[in-house]
């Protein structure tokens, strides 16, 4: 969100989506003409807009839904110009005379208009004048326009939903990144801040919302009292991408915070009536308070609206004062929502509310710095959510959710640095490419590292100073470093080895991260750019030679050691890292640093011994780290794969979520590579053996699955226990899934399966079952009132083992009446994640790429997910050839923001082929020996 995170799968963060346009035609245009350049000239700056919009929520005579609009933009001339260039996309203007009217403000004389034109490629309305506008003078440009209120989830769009048998239509917006121009002509760049006076003309039985509260109550439209006019208060100075307006018959639950800020949660009337907005309402006040305190700045607006939309491409979008969400990111039903649904709601709310200051009040000047905006929010979302749910240990979840998730991408030679030069980001497609996991999750990881080595207090001090200095303005990431440096310079207890900028430049200007290797015999410590494929060729040069300034914390035999900085040298020595023969040392406590760690073999063995004798001496995050790092190191040929597998032996005594999650996500690669081969049998047998104690632990703890554990991490661990036991064929688990699902089928009104367990029980029951189970679940999906329940069913339907059912299901994804557009790509990916469905999904994507790309092109990030999803198992020469052919066949259509994902898929497939060749035999033998 854009996160905004498009977390369809349970605790699977992904980046948000935004529209994409792929074009190279611009290169051939005359670049000396400013209207052929994608960046706006700075000759004119907007001061204020008056925008009136009238959406028609019934189709016109041509069967089209439209909106009409009127805009008056006040311009300040900075330097003489005889042309006005303003963004406009897919808007129609009068064909009679000029498209706009121009007036001088005060004593400004206005030249006559020569002609007006629309430049489609660069998305401009261009007004050619017979004379020049003069610096220091103000002008007003008025335009009236008409656009389609399409169901394309971009700009001013329409969303439809069913209430009983009645189709309801609402109008809503998604401006980020470059679609405000699709709603009204505007200077659609984040640094072109202005004030906005929004007026909505809407049917009088509907409610109008915008960023600001209404000025008084709505008034009837004089010409037609069936319509109302709602005028909103003037916004503060703000960017176009944060505008929002919505016309719907939604209802709300409200509260007024102690500081007088009105908090409202809006949703479909049914959802509000059933109390699904209450959890969001309960956490919003505390989260807003947390951030006001964290930023040392009051919430900058008089109200905070949050609304759950039936059709929404991103996970959520941080529009100032009117935050939009997918339903599953805002609504929570205690009866049918799982603990992970609840976690998603609180973290996405925290992410979006974090932006109300960082991003909205202070905004990055251009999209190349998106990583700071999104990375920051993706980090502090955990802090805000932790404040709202203090018993959940949410802050730990950044490690699996962001740090290790993005390291898998950042350890590829095709990765890219966080920072992209501004001049390399121009077109909407290039802007769209900024919204990836590097921006969100690596951004979050390095900002967390920065906050940790500065200490949170010092970080907050610099942050508050930055926000106060740049309120209502625009910045670059260097401005934040500067204010953090001032905070560092003003005290003496925290000493850094270099400036904040110098340290952070190493992490932002070069891609990837280091692996730190320790030799505990000598205390030698070294760093090296970590690549999952040790033979891959890094073509991107780095000014810092792929060396970093690395903050290192460590534990020796359970005792915390002094902090150490590894300078940007390849090798150093320190006795902190030297151990006696029976001792062990462990680096990167709680994985606060964005790097991985390798040890000499003796130290690895000592860590394993410790884990198998008394694992509680090692912090839970580091028990997970040992698994994550060693599996990655094995992939990179830095340790034997058997060492990584040995690091899972302690799990039969492990009850905590994070180490198990580390093992399951690391071994998921093994499943992808081997679930079509003879390795899979012994592997399942080993996992059954390891998980059985955990399964029995929770069976007892929950009184035979009738209760839930108290805290979040234990609930997640219980879900893992059942999911792992069932998917690896533990008979007690398969019986449990079958029994519970049968019970539900015989009494559909009463679902006996606890919401936490539904995803895994549904999936396993459908996998064991046939058409009856599938059709029953499909029927339940059709009548699911809550999107969380629908998500679980939609994903579980992909678990079938029947080829014909999966093929039929794939067909459904192209019919928006059966599968919503916003859910199409995630549904295809769910089918692809099933070993039986994978080749079907790949064939389907190849056959339908053109249609998918044309119909679903509004949601760009989902294309990278789609390509990633259907190619994840590729590990043979034949599959590599297919992928290369797919690339060749679709060059004309293009891949939009999936372009990079396609390159990554080719690279990953080659690495997979190699990995399987090298590891199949040794892995097979290890599993046979240990099962």
């Amino acid at each position: 969100y854009a996160q905004e995170k498009n977390k369809n799968a349970e605790h699977v963060p992904q980046a948000p989506t935004s529209p994409t346009i792929t074009t190279t035609a611009a290169i051939t245009l005359d670049q000396s003409k400013p209207w052929n350049r994608y960046r706006l000239p700075t000759t004119l700056l907007p001061d204020s807009y008056n925008v009136t919009l009238r959406p028609y929520l019934t189709p016109n005579a041509d069967g089209l839904y439209i909106f009409k609009g009127k805009s008056i933009v006040r311009l300040l001339c900075q330097e003489p110009t005889d042309v006005i260039i303003i963004h406009s996309k897919k808007l129609n203007y009068t064909t009679q005379g000029h498209m706009v009217v121009l007036r001088g403000v005060g004593d400004s004389q206005v030249p006559e208009i020569d002609r007006t034109e629309l430049v489609e490629l660069t998305e401009y309305l261009v007004v050619h004048l017979k004379g020049s506008l003069q610096p220091g003078h103000m002008y007003e440009m008025e335009s009236e326009f008409q656009g389609e209120l399409a169901d394309d989830l971009a700009g001013f769009y329409r969303s439809e939903y069913m209430e009983g048998n009645v189709k309801k239509v609402l109008a809503t917006t998604q401006m980020q990144s470059t679609d405000a121009r699709k709603s009204f002509p505007c200077f659609d760049e984040p640094a072109m801040k202005a004030t906005f006076n929004i007026t909505l003309i809407h049917p009088n039985n509907l409610t109008a919302l915008s960023n600001m509260p209404p000025k008084g109550s709505s008034t009837p439209l004089a010409e037609d009292p069936n319509w109302s006019v709602t005028e909103f208060e003037t916004t503060p100075v703000m960017s176009t991408y944060l505008l929002a307006y919505i016309v719907s018959e939604f209802q709300s639950v409200n509260e007024t915070a102690q500081n007088g800020v009105l908090i409202r949660i809006w949703a479909r009337p049914n959802a509000i009536a059933e109390g699904h907005g209450m959890y969001a309402l309960n956490v919003t006040g505390p989260i807003l308070n947390f951030f006001a305190n964290h930023y040392n700045t009051s919430y900058p607006l008089p109200k905070s609206d949050q609304i759950a939309l039936p059709d929404f491409n991103a996970g959520a979008m941080e529009n100032w004062g009117l935050v939009t969400y997918r339903e599953n990111a805002l609504l929570f039903d205690p009866q049918s929502s799982s603990i992970s649904n609840k976690e998603r709601v609180v973290t996405v709310i925290a992410h979006e509310l974090a932006h109300q200051w960082f991003g909205n009040l202070v905004t990055l000047a251009w999209w190349n710095d998106l990583w700071l905006n999104e990375g920051f929010a993706s980090y502090v979302e955990y802090l805000g959510a932790d404040h709202a749910e203090p018993t959940w240990n949410l802050k730990d979840l950044i490690v699996p959710g962001d740090v290790y998730r993005v390291m898998a991408v950042d350890a590829l030679a095709s990765s890219h640095p966080l920072t992209t030069p501004a001049e390399e980001v121009n077109t909407p497609a290039q802007i769209s490419e900024m919204f990836d996991s590097i921006s969100y999750s690596k951004g979050a990881s390095v900002i967390r590292m920065l906050s940790n080595f500065l200490t949170e207090d010092l970080f907050k001090e610099g942050l508050a100073s930055y926000l106060h200095a740049f309120a209502y303005q625009n910045t670059t990431y260097l401005d934040l470093w500067e204010h953090l440096q001032k905070a560092v310079d003003a005290q003496t207890s925290i000493r850094l080895p270099d400036t904040v900028r110098a340290i952070m430049d190493r992490w932002t200007l070069q891609m990837g991260f280091p692996v730190i290797t320790v030799d505990t015999k000598t205390g030698n410590i070294s760093q090296k750019h970590f690549l999952l494929d040790s033979e891959s060729n890094v073509t991107r040069s780095s000014a810092f030679d792929y060396l970093w300034i690395v903050p290192i914390s460590s534990i020796k035999n359970g005792v915390m050691q002094d902090h150490y900085w590894l300078r940007d040298v390849s090798q150093a020595q320190n006795d902190l890292f030297k151990t006696a023969s029976d001792d062990w040392v462990l680096l990167n406590v709680n994985v606060t640093g964005y790097f991985q760690v390798n040890y000499d073999e003796d130290n690895w063995r000592m860590i394993q011994h410790q884990l198998q004798t008394n694992l509680s001496v090692i912090p839970v995050i580091n028990r997970a780290q040992v698994i994550y790092d060693s599996f990655n190191l094995a992939t990179a040929h830095m340790v034997p794969v058997t060492l990584a597998l040995d690091n899972t032996l302690f799990l039969n005594g492990e009850k905590e979520y994070m180490p198990w999650q580390a093992a399951l996500s690391s071994l998921s690669y093994f499943s992808l590579m081997f679930d079509r081969s003879e390795v899979y049998g012994p592997m399942k047998k080993y996992l059954r053996k390891q998980v059985e104690p955990l399964f029995q632990h929770f069976e007892t703890l929950t009184k035979n699955w009738t209760e839930r554990p108290e805290n979040l991490m234990d609930q997640y661990s219980e879900i893992n226990a059942i999911s792992t036991a069932c998917s690896n064929g533990l008979p007690q688990c398969e019986n449990l899934a079958k029994t519970l699902f049968d019970q539900w089928m015989s009494d559909p009104e009463n679902n006996p399966i606890h919401p936490n367990l539904r995803s895994t029980i549904y999936c396993n029951a459908i996998a064991q079952g046939g058409q009856d189970q599938w059709d029953f679940a499909w029927g339940q999906l059709q009548q699911a009132q809550l999107v969380n329940e629908a998500d679980k069913l939609r994903s579980a339907l992909a678990c079938s083992n029947e080829v014909w059912l999966l093929n039929r299901y794939l067909g459904y994804t192209l019919n928006p009446d059966l599968i919503r557009k916003q859910d199409a790509t995630s549904t295809i990916n769910s089918i692809a994640s099933n070993v039986i469905g994978q080749p079907l999904a790949w064939d389907f994507v190849q056959s339908n790429w053109k249609k998918l790309f044309q119909d679903y092109g509004g949601g760009s990030f989902s294309f990278s997910n789609l390509i990633q999803g259907v190619t994840r198992r590729f590990s043979s020469e034949f599959e590599l050839q297919q992928l290369e052919q797919f690339k060749k066949n679709n060059m004309d259509v293009g891949f939009g923001s999936g372009t990079r994902a396609l390159e990554q898929a080719l690279e990953k497939t080659k690495a997979n082929i190699k990995w399987v060749k090298e590891n199949k035999e040794v892995v097979l033998n290890w599993f046979i020996e240990h099962s």
Epitope: R54, K70, T94, Q96, G97, V101
Partner: nanobody, 124 residues
Framework: QVQLQESGGGLVQAGGSLRLSCAAS????????MGWFRQAPGKEREFVAA????????NYADSVKGRFFISRDDAKNTVYLQMNSLKPEDTAVYYC?????????????????WGQGTQVTVSS
Amino acid sequence: QVQLQESGGGLVQAGGSLRLSCAASGRTFSSNAMGWFRQAPGKEREFVAAISWTGLTTNYADSVKGRFFISRDDAKNTVYLQMNSLKPEDTAVYYCAARQSGYASKFLDEYGYWGQGTQVTVSS
């Protein structure tokens, strides 16, 4: 080329209402701003009301504000003038006009196309 034909005029008592219609032929109607003007015997033609091509901008002469309402229906290529609380001084020939621009204007000379007019008489 736009042809305009007014209808709906007639005799009405003071305080009554009338609705004038102006049917337009020609493909560009939906892109034109439209206006109503009137001319009382022995007086100059004067602006009454105007509406922009989208219908989002309406302008009225001070003398009719709050009593007259202009609207348009692009599907029917028609512009309307709803006249309420009529007064004897509203008696005049009412003309419909189309502008070669999408933007509403009060100025007579900015309208290029005119209808024949329809008589409105308000008796006291």
